[in-house]
């Protein structure tokens, strides 16, 4: 019972975590204009992994996609990659863990197979969570070290560099969403790994009685027949999941030019 609860809870926590990682990756507010000690301006700038936005006091929001790959900083590309890898691994982990859930019966799947799959999904969740935490942390570090470039032209203005009133950026909501989501995915993965140990059939000692036809004495032989734990080469695990996950639908697509909200 405790194993099922641990596995179910691990699954739910990971599901929430991965949803959070997807949300954070899609969010525009990775960095937001630092309003502290700045002149009061009638525009508010914020930037995400995929586009930068400007919200005007009058009520209009204009977002511009980063229509370049080569022009973007390597760090931004790295953060994108980490988040996408986290989403892909998390999505695969979720798919695997659905089949691994003890409460779901799929044919005559053995507990050993379920234990294997639980462990696999747990490891995937852990790596997914670490990827998200790493991605968010790299971006946060980039913000701290730059306090966002004196030119304020990091990857929005690819054209001429115009000296402007310096716009400084600070941590956006997406960073906190990403950290929490990554942490939840990590915790969910650990819970799945713990549940895996409970799912694996334990070592059982069967008392073997040996009868000797010639003699009258009966000898009891404490012999051990090891039950398969599911991790050895003798397991009858079938390949349940192929491991190919698509990411196109995981990240929302953005308008091609200007998006006025």
């Amino acid at each position: 019972m405790a194993v099922t609860a641990c596995q179910g809870l691990g699954f739910v926590v990971s599901l929430i975590g991965i949803a959070g990682i997807i949300a954070a990756t899609c969010m525009d507010q990775w960095s937001t204009q630092d309003l502290y000690n700045n002149p009061v301006t009638a525009v508010f700038n914020y930037q995400g992994l995929w586009r930068s936005c400007v919200r005007e006091s009058s009520g209009f929001t204009e977002c511009r996609g980063y229509f370049t790959l080569l022009g973007l900083p390597a760090m931004l590309q790295a953060v994108r990659a980490l988040m996408i890898v986290g989403i892909v691994l998390g999505a695969i982990g979720l798919l695997v863990s659905i089949f691994a859930l003890k409460c779901i019966r799929i044919g005559s799947m053995e507990d050993s197979a379920k234990a294997n799959m639980t462990l696999t999904s747990g490891i995937m969740f852990i790596v997914s969570g670490l990827c998200a935490i790493a991605g968010v942390s790299v971006f946060a570090n980039m913000l701290v070290t730059n306090f966002w470039m004196s030119t304020a032209n990091m990857y929005t203005g690819m054209g001429g560099m115009v000296q402007t009133v310096q716009t400084r950026y600070t941590f956006g909501a997406a960073l906190f969403v990403g950290w929490v989501a990554g942490g939840l995915t990590l915790i969910g993965g650990v819970m799945m790994c713990i549940a895996c140990r409970g799912l694996a059939p334990e070592e059982t000692n069967y008392k073997a009685v040996s009868y000797h036809a010639s003699g009258h004495s009966v000898a009891y032989k404490p012999g051990g027949f090891k039950a398969s734990t599911g991790f050895g080469s003798n397991t009858k695990n079938k390949k349940i999941y192929d491991g190919g996950a698509r990411t196109e639908d995981e990240v929302q697509s953005y308008p091609s030019k200007h998006d006025y909200v």
């Epitope: 009061v40 009638a42 525009v43 930068s52 936005c53 400007v54 005007e56 006091s57 009520g59 716009t167």
Partner: antibody, heavy 117, light 113 residues
Framework: QVQLKESGPGLVAPSETLSITCTVS????????VQWVRQPPGKGLEWLGA???????NYNSALMSRLTISKDNSKSQVSLKMSSLTAADTAIYYC???????????WGQGTLVTVSS | DIVMTQSPSSLAVSLGERVTMNCKSS????????????LTWYQQKPGQPPKLLIY???TRESGVPDRFTGSGSGTDFTLTISSVQAEDLAVYYC?????????FGSGTKLEIK
């Protein structure tokens, strides 16, 4: 279509409080901001302040202590209150809708306020 | 507060002539986030409320004739009327729409010779 109409008292005594209401139609105050501008006779434009969609306000720093801008979204009305009036506050008072670039794309016809005893 | 300085204060031109008026701000009105200048031009004819001509320093408001062109960046801006018409007789104001409080220039009065 978008319309703004100011309604004011016309004549106000010095040291009294001016109250002007701007009634809007054709757009929602929950989506767009409204700004106030005044123009003394024969002079230039002076920005008084604004109330934005979210309800936050900004004021002309020279008039901040005397100005209050508020709104009633359900009635589609924005009100401007200015206390301690003097003859220098005699002007045409305009309300205008905020547009792209924080510019004022639609204006009311204005209401003339004369401060005199 | 941002100071907006307009020059000249008045202009007398002939119909069909090209006219240029300037506006200078005490601080850059360029927003780095979208590389747009928050400078607006208004036209005010006698007895009427101001009318929006140009926003973002160079974007014409819909319905504004294309003889009106806004240009400039940072602190220096220009409004050009390529061929002055009789109906262009008005006072033209520039406005800072970037820093609070928003501020207007003193205006340029366009008169017909």
């Amino acid at each position: 279509q978008v319309q703004l109409k100011e309604s004011g008292p016309g004549l106000v005594a010095p040291s009294e409080t001016l109250s002007i209401t701007c009634t809007v139609s054709g757009f929602s105050l929950t989506t767009y901001g409204v700004q106030w501008v005044r123009q003394p006779p024969g002079k230039g434009l002076e920005w008084l302040g604004a109330i934005w969609a979210g309800g936050n306000t900004n004021y002309n720093s020279a008039l901040m202590s005397r100005l209050t801008i508020s709104k009633d979204n359900s009635k589609s009305q924005v009100s401007l209150k200015m206390s301690s009036l003097t003859a220098a506050d005699t002007a045409i008072y305009y309300c205008a809708k905020g547009g792209y670039g924080n510019a004022m794309d639609y204006w009311g016809q204005g209401t003339l306020v004369t401060v005199s005893s | 507060d941002i100071v907006m300085t307009q020059s000249p204060s008045s202009l007398a031109v002939s119909l069909g002539e090209r006219v240029t008026m300037n506006c200078k701000s005490s601080q850059s009105l360029l927003n780095s986030g979208n590389q747009k200048n928050y400078l607006t031009w208004y036209q005010q004819k006698p007895g009427q409320p101001p009318k929006l001509l140009i926003y973002w320093a160079s974007t014409r408001e819909s319905g504004v004739p294309d003889r009106f062109t806004g240009s400039g960046s940072g602190t220096d801006f220009t409004l050009t009327i390529s061929s002055v018409q009789a109906e262009d007789l008005a006072v033209y104001y520039c406005q800072n729409d970037y820093f609070f409080p928003f501020t207007f220039g003193s205006g340029t009065k366009l008169e017909i010779k």
